[in-house]
C-alpha cells in the first residue's frame, strides 16, 4: 500500500532523471495507507482526532477505526467534488461520543456504515436522514452496524438510550432501503414501538446480547423480507401468541433464541407447542429453561403441558407476610 510517507523515484527509462520525487503526488492522507486498485483507504489506530480532509476521490472503502474522533460534525465527509464512490465506511472503535445531524451527508453511494464500539452519548435524530423534514431523501444505506454503541452510565443523556437510537433510525423514513441492522450489545431493555415498521426492507436484524425482557409491544408484521432475527443472549422469559404468529407469518425468517432465561411455567405452553411444530427457530433443541428452579436446564422441546404449571396465587386474605 502507498502512504503519505512513502516515496519512489522518477521513471527508470530516463537516464537523466534528477528528481527522487514521484512525478504525481500520492493523494494518500498522512497517517493513512491507500490502495488505488482496492479503492481502499485505511487510517487505522493512528489516534486521529478528525476525518482527513484530503481523502482521494477514488475511495470506496474507508477504514477510520481505532482513532479518537470524539465528534462527527455535520458534513464530516462532504467534499468538493463529493466522495461519490464511497460505499463502505468503518468508524468502529474511534471513541466517538457524538454524531451530529447530517454527519454522513453528500455520500451518495454509502451502502455500509459501521459505528460499532463507540460510546455514543449523543446520536442526532438526523444522523442518518440528514434533515429534519418529516420525509427526507432516501438514504443509500443498506447495512448499518451499531453494535456496542451504548455509553457508560455516567455519560448517558436523560432520555432513554433506546429512544435516542430509535429516533435516528426512523427520522424522515430515510432508512426504508436498509437490509441489515446490527444493534447487538447495547443494554437495550426494550425495542421502541414502531421502529421496525419504518424499516420494511430489513433482511437481517441482530438484537443479540441486549437485555430485552419482552417482545410484547414489538411488531414484526411488516418485515416480510426478514431472513435472520438474532435474539440470543437477552433476558427473554417467554414469547407470547401474538409474537409467535407474527414470526410464523414471515416467509423466509430464521430466528435465533439461544441463551435466554426462559421461564417454564403455564405461560410457556403456547411457545412450547409452537416450537415443536415450527421450522423458524434455529437450534431450537438447545433452548432450555432457566426458571423456576425445579425446571432449570430442562429442554423446552421435551416439555409437555403437565410440566408447565403456575403456582396458584393465593387470595389476599390468605396471604401471609
Amino acid at each position: 500500500t502507498s502512504s503519505a510517507s512513502s516515496s519512489s523515484s522518477s521513471a527508470p527509462f530516463l537516464a537523466s532523471a534528477a528528481s527522487a520525487q514521484p512525478p504525481l503526488p500520492d493523494q494518500c492522507p498522512a497517517l493513512c495507507e491507500c490502495s488505488e486498485a482496492a479503492r481502499t483507504v485505511k487510517c487505522v489506530n493512528r489516534n486521529l482526532t478528525e476525518v482527513p480532509t484530503d481523502l482521494p476521490l477514488y475511495v470506496r472503502n474507508l477504514f477510520l477505526t481505532g482513532n479518537q474522533l470524539a465528534v462527527l460534525p455535520a458534513g464530516a465527509f462532504a467534499r468538493r467534488p463529493p466522495l461519490a464512490e464511497l460505499a463502505a465506511l468503518n468508524l468502529s472503535g474511534s471513541r466517538l461520543d457524538e454524531v451530529r445531524g447530517g454527519a454522513f451527508e453528500h455520500l451518495p453511494s454509502l451502502r455500509q456504515l459501521d459505528l460499532s464500539h463507540n460510546p455514543l452519548a449523543y446520536l442526532s435524530p438526523f444522523a442518518f436522514s440528514g434533515s429534519n423534514a418529516s420525509i427526507s431523501a432516501p438514504s443509500p444505506l443498506v447495512e448499518l452496524i451499531l453494535n456496542h454503541i451504548v455509553p457508560p452510565d455516567d455519560k448517558r443523556q436523560n432520555r432513554s438510550f433506546e429512544g435516542m437510537v430509535a429516533a435516528a433510525l426512523v427520522a424522515g423514513r430515510a432508512l426504508q432501503g436498509l437490509h441489515l441492522l446490527e444493534l447487538a450489545s447495547n443494554h437495550f431493555l426494550y425495542l421502541p414501538r414502531d421502529v421496525l415498521a419504518q424499516l420494511p426492507s430489513l433482511r437481517y436484524l441482530d438484537l443479540s446480547n441486549n437485555s430485552l425482557v419482552s417482545l410484547t409491544y414489538v411488531s414484526f408484521r411488516n418485515l416480510t423480507h426478514l431472513e435472520s432475527l438474532h435474539l440470543e443472549d437477552n433476558a427473554l422469559k417467554v414469547l407470547h401468541n401474538g409474537t409467535l404468529a407474527e414470526l410464523q407469518g414471515l416467509p423466509h425468517v430464521r430466528v435465533f433464541l439461544d441463551n435466554n432465561p426462559w421461564v417454564c411455567d403455564c405461560h410457556m405452553a403456547d411457545m412450547v407447542t409452537w416450537l415443536k411444530q415450527t421450522g423458524v427457530v434455529q437450534g431450537k433443541d438447545r433452548l432450555t429453561c432457566a426458571f423456576p428452579e425445579k425446571m432449570r436446564n430442562r429442554v423446552l422441546l421435551e416439555l409437555n403441558s403437565a410440566d408447565l404449571d403456575c403456582d396458584p396465587i393465593l387470595p389476599p386474605s390468605l396471604q401471609t407476610s
Epitope: 521513471a11 504525481l24 491507500c34 486498485a37
Partner: antibody
Framework: EVQLQQSGPVLVKPGASVKMSCEAS????????MSWVKQSRGRSLEWIGV????????IYNQKFKGKATLTVDKSSSTAYMELSSLTSEDSGVYSC????????????WGQGTSVAVSS | ENVLTQSPAIMSASPGEKVTMTCRAT???????FHWYQQKSGASPKVWIY???NLASGVPARFSGSGSGTSFSLTISSVEAEDVATYFC?????????FGGGTKLEIK
C-alpha cells in the same frame, strides 16, 4: 524506485501471436492499475486496456478486444499482454504503464517492447 | 469515445519565445482528468502537466497549463533547447482513455 521492466523486441510473421511481459518493482504491485499503450511509428498513443491486479477486473478499449489479452502473475509482480492474429498494422512499440486512478493519468512507463510483423 | 485533436501538429520556435499549443476534445472533460505528457526522441513519455494546470515533479516553471470543458492549452513562457519534444494531451471521461495526436516542438 519504481521500475517497469519489459521483455525484448520481437519479429514475428503475420498470423502469429506474441506474449510480452512487464515486471514491476519498487512498489506494491497489487495496489495500482496497470495499463498498456501502443505507439505506432510516427503515430500517436493508443490506450489498449487496463488490469486491476487486486480484483482481476480487466477493461479493454473496444478497438483492441479480441486482439489483446491482459493477464498478471501477482506472485512475481508481472503483467503480460498477448497479441494474436498479428498483421502489419499491429507493428509498433507496446508499453506497460502504471495508471493512477487518483487522476486517471500515467505516472510510470515501461521502456516498451517493439513488435515488428513481417513476412 | 472522446477524441482529442491537437494543434498545431508541428511548431517551430526560437529560444526565449513564448509558445502555446492546444488540445480540443469532442466532449467535455473534467479538469482533474486532463493531462499533458512530454516525449523526447527514443524515450517513453513522461507526465508533464496533470489535472489541467499542475506541473509534475521536476517540470520547469516556464511551463503552464490551462483550459476547461473541451478546450485546453499548454504554454511555455520562454522556450529553451531542452524543450524539444512531442507533447501529447490525454483525457479520461470514462473508458477508453484517449490521447491527442501530439504537437512536435522544434527549435529554430
Amino acid at each position: 524506485e519504481v521500475q517497469l521492466q519489459q521483455s525484448g523486441p520481437v519479429l514475428v510473421k503475420p498470423g502469429a501471436s506474441v506474449k510480452m511481459s512487464c515486471e514491476a518493482s519498487g512498489y506494491s504491485f497489487i495496489d495500482y492499475y496497470m495499463s498498456w499503450v501502443k505507439q505506432s511509428r510516427g503515430r500517436s498513443l493508443e490506450w489498449i486496456g487496463v488490469f486491476n491486479p487486486y480484483s482481476g477486473e480487466i477493461i479493454y478499449n473496444q478497438k483492441f478486444k479480441g486482439k489483446a489479452t491482459l493477464t498478471v502473475d501477482k506472485s512475481s509482480s508481472t503483467a503480460y499482454m498477448e497479441l494474436s492474429s498479428l498483421t502489419s498494422e499491429d507493428s509498433g512499440v507496446y508499453s506497460c504503464a502504471r495508471l493512477r486512478i487518483s487522476y486517471y493519468a500515467i505516472d510510470y512507463w515501461g521502456q516498451g517492447t517493439s513488435v515488428a510483423v513481417s513476412s | 469515445e472522446n477524441v482529442l485533436t491537437q494543434s498545431p501538429a508541428i511548431m517551430s520556435a526560437s529560444p526565449g519565445e513564448k509558445v502555446t499549443m492546444t488540445c480540443r476534445a469532442t466532449s467535455s472533460v473534467s479538469s482533474g482528468h486532463f493531462h499533458w505528457y512530454q516525449q523526447k526522441s527514443g524515450a517513453s513519455p513522461k507526465v508533464w502537466i496533470y489535472s489541467t494546470s499542475n506541473l509534475a515533479s521536476g517540470v520547469p516553471a516556464r511551463f503552464s497549463g490551462s483550459g476547461s470543458g473541451t478546450s485546453f492549452s499548454l504554454t511555455i513562457s520562454s522556450v529553451e533547447a531542452e524543450d524539444v519534444a512531442t507533447y501529447f494531451c490525454q483525457q479520461y471521461s470514462g473508458y477508453p482513455l484517449t490521447f491527442g495526436g501530439g504537437t512536435k516542438l522544434e527549435i529554430k
